[in-house]
Amino acid sequence: FERTRSLQDPCSNCPAGTFCDNNRNQICSPCPPNSFSSAGGQRTCDICRQCKGVFRTRKECSSTSNAECDCTPGFHCLGAGCSMCEQDCKQGQELTKKGCKDCCFGTFNDQKRGICRPWTNCSLDGKSVLVNGTKERDVVCGPSPADLSPGASSVTPPAPAREPGHSPQ
């Protein structure tokens, strides 16, 4: 089948990095500067992506592959192939329509991107707060208040839970 196709279509012999030049009797011509073809048999080469402005070049364009961009410091990639650069915020902040804003009380963000999330509610797991939360950090839950007998250290890890009916070894 391949041989049949190449007899019918001389362009199928043109490798990646070239294009089938109709102006030159369908000769395989190299892609011009700043263009590429990533597959064989192409009749045109694609224009290389330019990483300009807030985008910086992660990988240069070659005759067989497009350029790849990422974002300049202070920004991070969004979308397929880094189609957008989004502004970083500081830890303890989130990006809103009006720019970076501090997390509200009771929420935190430990990254430079994303949204502020509520602190863990330790009491839902029957535990107590060992370390208070901040804008940048979640609370740290400790043992349940019942586990803290008088004089016991609050940082001692709780004993592993045993299934009912099992006696200690």
Epitope: R49, Q50, G53, V54, F55, C69, F75, L78, S83, M84, C85, E86, Q87, L95, K98, G99
Partner: nanobody, 121 residues
Framework: QVQLQESGGGLVQAGGSLRLSCAAS????????IGWFRQAPGKEREGVLC????????YYADSVKGRFTISRDNAKNTVYLQMTNLKPEDTAVYLC??????????????WGQGTQVTVSS
């Protein structure tokens, strides 16, 4: 044809001031934010300041707070970067870009070529 043209750069003594302009043409200026970036020799490009289409400003660089301000004149399709108390570390090529929003830039955004600012000690 879309164009962003920076001007106002030059050589200035430390402690001095400069006002850069970014003049836009070929697109609906009022719909776009304008962000200023700078690139010093051998360093990464960094964001400086941005002004939204409604006039709110976003500082990208903490190091310029209290020294640089940004404003826009929609009648003249121009954004101004007022730089005071300049320091040698502000030496860079300053360029402006036109995103829809100060928080997001896309591959389709317009960019100028830049203007050189040199601060001597």
């Amino acid at each position: 044809q879309v164009q962003l043209q920076e001007s106002g750069g030059g050589l200035v003594q430390a402690g001095g001031s400069l006002r850069l302009s970014c003049a836009a043409s070929g697109f609906t200026f009022d719909d776009y934010a304008i962000g200023w970036f700078r690139q010093a020799p051998g360093k990464e490009r960094e964001g400086v300041l941005c002004i939204s289409s409604s006039g709110g400003s976003t500082y990208y660089a903490d190091s310029v707070k209290g020294r640089f301000t940004i404003s826009r004149d929609n009648a003249k399709n121009t954004v101004y970067l007022q730089m005071t108390n300049l320091k040698p570390e502000d030496t860079a090529v300053y360029l402006c870009g036109a995103p829809r929003d100060c928080s997001y830039y896309t591959s389709d955004d317009y960019w100028g070529q830049g203007t050189q600012v040199t601060v001597s000690s």
